[in-house]
């Protein structure tokens, strides 16, 4: 297996309520094959925010073309941010399997939400 790193360059991001938040994530390799998922929080209670291969996430849009065969940019944009979205978001690489196996997580990006400017 090649060494793979998941890089979340920003430790924190601050966004005004009602705006969109961009959470950056890149992988250094596509191997081993398997999906990327985004979570808020850690542990068994973590919340799935985006799954590369399945699910409906109406507020989440990939920043780069996810259908590119050589895509290693797994950044996402979350629209219409509210205070309830605050938290630490993790970009996690999985290796294919039944079920998929968690391989490596980014360091996390803390999203804070500012009050809407009046």
């Amino acid at each position: 297996e090649e060494e793979l790193q998941v890089i979340q360059p920003e430790k924190s991001v601050s966004v005004a309520a009602g705006e969109s938040a961009t959470l950056n994530c890149t992988a250094t390799s596509l191997i081993p094959v398997g999906p990327i998922q985004w979570f808020r929080g850690v542990g068994p209670g973590r919340e799935l925010i985006y799954h590369q291969k399945e699910g409906h996430f109406p507020r989440v849009t990939p920043v780069s073309d996810p259908t590119k065969r050589n895509n290693m940019d797994f950044s996402i944009r979350i629209s219409n941010i509210t205070p309830a979205d605050a938290g630490t978001y993790y970009c996690v690489k999985f290796r294919k399997g039944s079920p998929d196996v968690e391989l490596k997580s980014g360091a996390g990006t803390e999203l804070s939400v500012r009050a809407k400017p009046s």
Partner: antibody, heavy 117, light 108 residues
Framework: DVQLVESGGGVVRPGESLRLSCAVS????????MSWVRQAPGKGLEWVSG???????YYVDSVKGRFTISRDNSKNTLYLQVNSLTAEDTAIYYC???????????WGLGTLVTVSS | SYELTQPPSVSVSPGQTARITCSGG??????YAWYQQKPGQAPVTVIH???KRPSDIPERFSGSSSGTTVTLTISGVQAEDEADYYC???????????FGGGTKLTVL
């Protein structure tokens, strides 16, 4: 229902060109990568070319420089321009929708290209 | 790139279990699928992502992988399952799709 309908095949002479089309319906075409796969008479399947939703293109070595894949998301149509055709290009050409990991989940019925002098 | 190798033919009696193998890819860099093709028809995907069955495919079709070999299993084979079956792979190193040579399944 997902539907893929190819057209544009025919009989041509060696060195000539064709443009194959694949009209799709039943899903959001602009969100999916697509591919062309061909099958020579009595032979197996051969992947020819793929294109991402944003237009990045990929080809098998044997057709690089001769074939060009493209798409028009506003027309829900996939294309394959095939130039400098040889007898070895004689095949049924299928368009196929790609899964998130570049396998295929839906296929068209195919269009036959025959190259003969 | 790599080659995917399948047996040219497999024969099975109705109601029995058919297993078709495919070898040659690198497990860590390759996703696999199985495509069914009946004479004069277009291929139909019966398994993708190694073991995922499309919703309209009967449950008797299943996929599995072990090391560099993937297997299509058809439990309780029916006469209508007689077809050519192609193993397909997508290689994340080369960005290329590859197919095996196909296996003719005969239902005796």
């Amino acid at each position: 229902d997902v539907q893929l309908v190819e057209s544009g095949g025919g009989v041509v002479r060696p060195g000539e060109s064709l443009r194959l089309s694949c009209a799709v319906s039943g899903f959001r075409f602009s969100s999916y990568a697509m591919s062309w796969v061909r099958q020579a008479p009595g032979k197996g399947l051969e992947w020819v070319s793929g294109i991402s939703s944003g237009g990045d293109t990929y080809y098998v070595d044997s057709v690089k420089g001769r074939f060009t894949i493209s798409r028009d998301n506003s027309k829900n149509t996939l294309y394959l321009q095939v130039n400098s055709l040889t007898a070895e290009d004689t095949a049924i050409y299928y368009c196929a929708r790609e899964t998130w990991n570049h396998l295929f989940d839906y296929w068209g019925l195919g269009t036959l290209v025959t190259v003969s002098s | 790139s790599y080659e995917l190798t399948q047996p040219p033919s497999v024969s099975v009696s109705p109601g029995q279990t058919a297993r078709i193998t495919c070898s040659g890819g690198d497990y860590y860099s390759t996703y696999y699928a199985w495509y069914q093709q009946k004479p004069g028809q277009a291929p139909v995907t019966v398994i993708h992502s190694d073991d995922k069955r499309p919703s309209d495919i009967p449950e008797r079709f299943s996929g599995s992988s072990s090391g560099t070999t993937v297997t299509l299993t058809i439990s309780g084979v029916q006469a209508e399952d007689e077809a050519d079956y192609y193993c397909g792979g997508y290689d994340g190193r080369t960005y290329i799709n590859t197919f095996g040579g196909g296996t003719k399944l005969t239902v005796l």
